[in-house]
């Protein structure tokens, strides 16, 4: 049986099926006879009882509150009440990234050593009976794998395996098609001592700004002690007194590597700061990785074609 939803704070992506399962479900004999209630409270409303009549998207089962699908306005606090038992969750529903096959904020990062066993299995036990098919994507390109019920990768890791792997489960419910996406950011690191340094996040970032305001561009990397991280922009950095590099911050990871962060601060943004590349580079003896930031006037963001947001 699917385990209960014990995390009190949950973030989910709009448009996907989602469920909350309370943790007193094992008291089956009590469930039959006891009054059970689900409530929601959000900014404007205090403790509104939920039932299938409150929304066609909501379904109630013995232990579970289901959303078909969850939407932005489902954000809020949820309560399950039965006798003297209460369980509370805070649900944050975030926007889907319409320009990618996954949403950046809902990515699980994993580090795998090169030549070590590397496995990705696409499975979803709760919705298993409803799933028609499942596809596995790497960097939003579909992988052709034999098993389309539970696609799996099992191999010894190579550097080329690095990337974003998305399991997409397609399922039907009440005549409608839904999908559930689970994405892993797989970083392949050197075996033994050194890792290949990698910058975290998308390679190209458009940042919406207003003229005259300030902006902080944060560049984060996973690197070795001897590696360096630096900003480069324009042919002559010397020409803009409003641009400042802040001190690099480093934290050691449990694996003995380093998580570094270096901020570029641009004050009193002018026209000359727009639509130019601000590049952050991490460098080691084994190679480099670079990510770019472009400042775009807030009003112009709508004009950027979707494809520039893909990695």
């Amino acid at each position: 049986a699917e385990s209960c939803t014990s995390r009190p704070h949950i973030t989910v992506v709009e448009g996907e099926p989602f469920y909350l399962k309370h943790c007193s479900c094992s008291l089956a004999h009590e469930i039959e006879t006891t009054t059970k209630s689900w409530y929601k409270s959000s900014g404007s409303q205090e403790h509104v009882e939920l039932n299938p009549r409150s929304s066609s998207r909501i379904a109630l089962h013995d232990c579970v509150l289901e959303f078909w699908p969850v939407e932005l306005n489902d954000t809020g606090s949820y309560f399950f009440q039965m006798k003297n038992y209460t369980q509370k969750w805070k649900l944050n529903v975030i926007r889907r990234n319409k320009h990618s096959c996954f949403t950046e904020r809902q990515v699980t990062s994993k580090i795998v050593e090169v030549k070590k066993f590397f496995q990705i299995t696409c499975e979803n036990s709760y919705y298993q009976t409803l799933v028609n098919s499942t596809s596995l994507y790497k960097n939003c390109k579909k992988l052709l794998l034999e098993n389309n019920k539970n696609p799996t990768i099992k191999k010894n890791a190579e550097f080329e395996d690095q990337g974003y792997y998305s399991c997409v489960h397609f399922l039907h419910h009440n005549g409608k098609l839904f999908n559930i996406t689970k994405t892993f950011n797989i970083t392949i690191v050197e075996d033994r001592s050194n890792i290949v340094p990698v910058l975290l996040g998308p390679k190209l970032n458009h940042v919406a700004v207003e003229l005259g305001k300030n902006v902080r561009l944060n560049c984060s990397a996973l690197l070795n002690e001897e590696d360096v991280i630096y900003w480069m922009f324009g042919e002559e950095n010397g020409s803009d007194p409003n641009i400042h590099e802040e001190k690099e911050m480093r934290i050691m990871t449990p694996e003995g590597k380093w998580h570094a962060s270096k901020v570029l601060r641009i004050e009193n943004i002018g026209e000359s700061n727009l639509n130019v590349l601000y590049n952050c580079t991490v460098a080691s003896t084994g190679g480099t990785d670079t990510k770019s930031f472009i400042l775009v006037r807030k009003a112009d963001m709508a004009d950027i074609p979707g494809h520039v947001f893909t990695r």
Partner: nanobody, 116 residues
């Protein structure tokens, strides 16, 4: 494999000058854009100046603009850092390396100490 050797450091009074040199004892870096980094006690290495492979483009960190000058002599396979109006906060070990691009193995660096 390129072996980098930095020299020219020393102890100097605030306001004084030093000229650092970076040469390759093995191999060559004439085709590489190069930079000078420094590492103060308890800090990370920071890039203070860089120069393009031909020497036509130079860039400097805020903290050294107007005081430090990077140059190179490709015939001698050497990169220089002229440091004027030195301040106590310039105290660090100075290293050269390729910027941007994969790093060469770090040299021993050269210690610069600025007393007040």
């Amino acid at each position: 494999e390129v072996q980098l050797v930095e020299s020219g450091g020393g102890l100097v009074q605030a306001g004084g000058s030093l000229r650092l040199s970076c040469a390759a004892s093995r191999g060559t870096f004439t085709g590489d854009p190069m930079g000078w980094f420094r590492r103060a006690p308890g800090e990370q290495r920071e890039l203070v100046a860089r120069i393009s492979s031909g020497g036509s483009t130079t860039n400097y960190a805020d903290s050294v603009k107007g005081r430090f000058t990077i140059s190179r002599d490709n015939a001698k396979n050497t990169v220089y850092l002229q440091m004027n109006s030195l301040k106590p906060e310039d105290t660090a070990v100075y290293y050269c390396n390729r910027v941007p691009g994969s790093l060469h193995y770090w040299g021993q660096g050269t210690q610069v100490t600025v007393s007040s």
